[in-house]
């Protein structure tokens, strides 16, 4: 808390300019009018204020706007945004994408801070959904943003927004998140032809069910091993050797290197060894010839 002192003669600030860098904290408190500061916030960002001087400027704005800053001030906070706490930001009503961009720019190159997370949360809640322009902006600044959302939050992403998603934006998504995103992607890309569709849907396939993988195997897509290894195990297990061979095309040889890892390992255990041998890769661990495979889940359903 800065003590209230009278402004020295001749030091009253008539505008926000570089001369203020020479003001001590108490002089800033005494000589800078909060309303002047609010109307000239855009100038603050060009002036090399110290950490402590910024504290004083923030204090002045807090006194002027105890219920939260108006968007006209928020948009021009610049690096004063770094002084805001999540509690401060929860008082804001940010509706303009330009305001969001301006504040994300301040934090550019750094990890997503609690302040930024709160800002994004306020913005998205205010909009009601993650529209394409917002998603475009957020993933441009934070490629991992999408994967930081819960499945419930992802459910508010409209299929049209999926066009803004790049493969690297999904790198850290877990299967539960891809389960939500995949159907949206399938809907978004449904009017594309085979090869183009596969290029777009590929990074979402970690959420694909068995029937969609079977359908893809009929389209000569040549899925790479990295994509195959990210598929849901429960979706891969029912695929036949012939279907996996068609799905992977020339990449099928890569199965040998991955035979000890999921989902390949679990899939091998479900295949007849005879069928695996047709691949000529030396995959071992399949069901020996002459053994009968009972699907107990089917038996339970019938009883």
């Amino acid at each position: 808390e800065v003590e209230k002192t009278a402004c020295p003669s001749g030091k009253k600030a008539r505008e926000i300019d570089e001369s203020l860098i020479f003001y001590k904290k108490w002089e800033l408190e005494a000589c800078v009018d909060a309303a002047l500061l609010a109307t000239q916030m855009d100038r603050v960002n060009a002036i090399p204020f110290t950490y402590e001087q910024l504290d004083v400027l923030k204090h002045k704005l807090d006194e002027l706007y105890p219920q939260g800053y108006p968007e006209s001030v928020i948009q021009h906070l610049g690096y004063l945004f770094l002084k805001m706490s999540p509690e401060d930001i929860r008082k804001w009503n940010v509706t303009s994408l330009e305001t969001l961009k301006a504040l994300l720019e301040v934090n550019k190159g750094h990890e997503m801070s609690p302040q930024v997370a709160t800002l994004i949360d306020r913005f998205v809640k205010g909009r009601g959904q993650l529209d394409k322009d917002t998603l475009d902006t957020l993933t441009a600044f934070y490629p991992g943003y999408l994967c930081s959302l819960s499945p419930e939050e992802l459910s508010s992403v409209p299929p049209s927004s999926i066009w803004a998603v790049r493969p690297q934006d999904l790198d850290t998504c877990d299967p539960r998140q891809l389960d939500v995103l995949y159907p949206k992607a399938r809907l978004a890309f449904q009017n594309m032809n085979g090869s183009e569709y596969f290029v777009k849907i590929q990074s979402f396939l970690g959420g694909a069910p068995t029937e969609d993988l079977k359908a893809l195997s009929q389209q000569n897509v040549s899925m790479d091993l990295a994509t195959f290894m990210k598929l849901r195990t429960d979706a891969v297990l029912p695929l036949t050797v012939a279907e996996v061979q068609k799905l992977l095309g020339p990449h099928v040889e890569g199965l040998k290197a991955e035979e000890r890892h999921r989902p390949v390992r679990d899939w091998i255990l479900r295949q007849r060894q005879d069928d695996l041998d047709t691949l000529g890769l030396g995959l071992q661990g399949g069901i020996p010839n002459g053994y009968l495979v009972l699907d107990l889940s089917m038996q339970e359903a019938l009883s």
Epitope: F22, Y23, K24, A46, P48, F49, T50, Y51, Y79
Partner: nanobody
């Protein structure tokens, strides 16, 4: 204890260039604004360049604007002053200083490095 150590001074001809460096040790730099001052014989200290903690905002007085450039590398704990188009009146001892308060109130000072501009 915090220390600021300047280097890079020397004798240079008018119109020439010099680059001064300021190395910081101790718990300093990333949160501090940094300034370069100079003091000519018989005169007071004069601020010639000032840079914010993040490094993206700077201030120069009219006497050096367009000729001097201040920069910093927080990872290396260094601050630099690039001086071009040097004049005889730039001759002085140059000091590096650090502040968290204001541009008129410094917490730490270096010992200085002599810059002489003469033909």
């Amino acid at each position: 204890e915090v220390q600021l150590v300047e280097s890079g001074g020397g004798l240079v001809q008018p119109g020439g260039s010099l680059r001064l460096s300021c190395a910081a040790s101790g718990r300093i730099l990333s949160n501090y604004n940094m300034g370069w001052f100079r003091q000519a014989p018989g005169k007071g200290r004069e601020l010639v360049a000032y840079i914010s903690w993040g490094g993206s905002r700077t201030y120069y007085p009219d006497s050096v604007e367009g000729r001097f450039t201040i920069s910093r590398d927080n990872a290396k704990r260094m601050v630099y002053l690039q001086m071009n188009s040097l004049r005889a009146e730039d001759t002085a001892v140059y000091y590096c200083a650090a502040t968290i308060n204001s541009a008129s109130d410094y917490d730490y000072w270096g010992q200085g490095t002599q810059v002489t501009v003469s033909s």
